[in-house]
C-alpha cells in the first residue's frame, strides 16, 4: 500500500546518506505527516539548510574537501539573516574559513557553489578585504565591529563552517 | 630588516630580450607578492605587474602582456622580469615592491636600469 | 583604467613650511590611495597607505586625508630631507595606477 511504499522509499534515502551520516535528526515540515526534513546530528538547522562547525585547524583547501566529503560545501552566507544564525554558534576567540576565495588574486570573489558575488550582501569587517596575497575569507570577531569577514592567506590553518541542504525525506 | 636587492643595469639592443633580478631578505619570501614598476626617463610611474611568490601566478597590466614574463626562485628568494622584443621606449628603470597590506606596495627595490640602444 | 591626476607637477616651499600635495582619482577608489616619496637617487619609499595611515619608520609630519576621488598629502613642518618627487597611487582596482608626480624644491 502507499504508506508501504513510502516508508520503503524513506529508509533508502536513508541508507544513502548513512555512509557519511550515521544519525539524522528529523522534524516534521508543516502538517503534513509525510514530509521530514533532517539534518545530520548533531548539525544545527535554519531554513533549508544545514551548519557543521568544524574545529579541526586546515588549510582553506582542506577544510572545503572535509566539507565535501560530509556531502556539504564551506558555508556560502546569502543573507544578513543567515550570518546572524551562524554567528550564534562561533566562538569569538577562533576565525573560520567561509566558502569565498579570490583564486586569481585578482579581487574576483566567488563562492564555491557558484551563487554569483553579489557585493551588496558582503559583511566584510572596515578595510577589508585588503592583500592580493591574501585569497581566502574567514570569519571573525572585531570588538569594534562585532562579526564581520576578512581575508587571509589560505594556507594558513583555520577552522571552519560547512552547509549542506535539508535532506527531505 | 626588509630589503630588495636588484640586479644591477644592464645595456641591450633592440629586439633582444633581458632578465632582471630581484632577492628579498629580511622576511617570508613566499608570503608576499612581487610587483613591478617602471619609470621612464623624467616620467611618472607604470604598474607592469604582480607575481604571487606562493601560487607562482601573475597578473600582468594589459599594457605590457607579450613583453614581460614574470617568475620567481622560492629556492633563492628571488623575482625575475624577462622583457622580450626591446625597443628603444623600453628604457627605462624598472623596480621590484613587495606586495603588502592595503593595496600597497611596501618596501622597493633600488631600480635597475635597463637602457635599448643600437 | 582609473586616471590619477597631479595638478601640480611642481612646488617650491621654504623649510617649515606646510605644504600640501593633492590627488584625484577618475572614479571612487574607497580609500585605497597611497603615497610614496622618490628621492632624487630613486630610492622609492612608502610613505602613507589606505589614505591616512602611516608607514612604519615614517615621520609624523607626513599626514594624508581624503575620500571618495580626491585626496591629499600633508608635510606639516617641511624639512632638507622631504626635497623629492611624491606620488600617489590607486590600488582598489587593477591595473594600479599612479599620479604623474609632485616634485618638491626649496625655495
Known amino acids: 500500500n502507499f504508506m508501504y511504499s513510502k516508508t520503503v522509499k524513506r529508509l533508502s534515502k536513508l541508507r544513502e546518506y548513512q555512509q557519511y551520516h550515521p544519525s539524522l535528526t528529523c522534524v516534521m515540515e508543516g502538517k503534513d505527516i509525510e514530509d521530514w526534513s533532517c539534518c545530520p546530528t548533531p548539525w544545527t538547522s535554519f531554513q533549508s539548510s544545514c551548519y557543521f562547525i568544524s574545529t579541526g585547524m586546515q588549510s582553506w583547501t582542506k577544510s572545503q574537501k572535509n566539507c565535501s566529503v560530509m556531502g556539504a560545501d564551506l558555508v556560502v552566507i546569502n543573507t544578513r539573516e543567515e550570518q546572524d544564525f551562524i554567528i550564534q554558534n562561533l566562538k569569538r576567540n577562533s576565525s573560520y574559513f567561509l566558502g569565498l576565495s579570490d583564486p586569481g588574486g585578482r579581487r574576483h570573489w566567488q563562492w564555491v557553489d557558484q551563487t554569483p558575488y553579489n557585493e551588496n550582501v558582503t559583511f566584510w569587517h572596515s578595510g577589508e578585504p585588503n592583500n592580493l596575497d591574501e585569497r581566502c575569507a574567514i570569519i571573525n570577531f572585531r570588538s569594534s565591529e562585532e562579526w564581520g569577514w576578512n581575508d587571509i592567506h589560505c594556507h594558513v590553518p583555520q577552522k571552519s563552517i560547512c552547509k549542506m541542504k535539508k535532506i527531505y525525506i | 630588516q626588509v630589503q630588495l636587492q636588484q640586479s644591477g643595469a644592464e645595456v641591450v639592443k633592440p629586439g633582444a630580450s633581458v632578465k632582471i633580478s630581484c632577492k628579498g631578505s629580511?622576511?617570508?619570501?613566499?608570503?608576499?607578492?612581487m610587483h613591478w614598476v617602471r619609470q621612464a626617463h623624467a616620467k611618472s610611474l607604470e604598474w607592469i605587474g604582480v607575481?604571487?611568490?606562493?601560487?607562482?601566478?601573475?597578473n600582468y597590466n594589459q599594457k605590457f602582456k607579450g613583453k614581460v614574463t614574470m617568475t620567481v626562485d622560492t629556492s633563492s628568494s628571488t623575482a625575475y622580469m624577462e622583457l622580450s622584443r626591446l625597443r628603444s621606449d623600453d628604457t627605462a628603470v624598472y623596480y621590484c615592491?613587495?606586495?603588502?597590506?592595503?593595496?600597497?606596495?611596501?618596501?622597493w627595490g633600488q631600480g635597475t636600469l635597463v637602457t635599448v640602444s643600437s | 583604467d582609473i586616471q590619477m591626476t597631479q595638478t601640480t607637477s611642481s612646488l617650491s616651499a621654504s623649510l617649515g613650511d606646510r605644504v600640501t600635495i593633492s590627488c584625484r582619482a577618475s572614479?571612487?577608489?574607497?580609500?585605497?590611495l597611497n603615497w610614496y616619496q622618490q628621492k632624487p637617487d630613486g630610492t622609492v619609499k612608502l610613505l602613507i597607505y589606505?589614505?591616512?595611515r602611516l608607514h612604519s619608520g615614517v615621520p609624523s609630519r607626513f599626514s594624508g586625508s581624503g575620500s571618495g576621488t580626491d585626496y591629499s598629502l600633508t608635510i606639516s613642518n617641511l624639512d632638507q630631507e622631504d626635497i623629492a618627487t611624491y606620488f600617489c597611487?590607486?590600488?582598489?582596482?587593477?591595473?594600479?595606477?599612479f599620479g604623474g608626480g609632485t616634485k618638491l624644491e626649496i625655495k
Open positions: 607575481i604571487s611568490t606562493y601560487y607562482g601566478d601573475s
Open positions: 629580511g622576511y617570508t619570501f613566499t608570503d608576499y607578492s
Open positions: 589606505y589614505t591616512s
Open positions: 597611487q590607486q590600488g582598489n582596482t587593477l591595473p594600479w595606477t
Open positions: 615592491a613587495r606586495n603588502g597590506n592595503f593595496y600597497v606596495m611596501d618596501y
Open positions: 572614479q571612487d577608489i574607497s580609500n585605497y
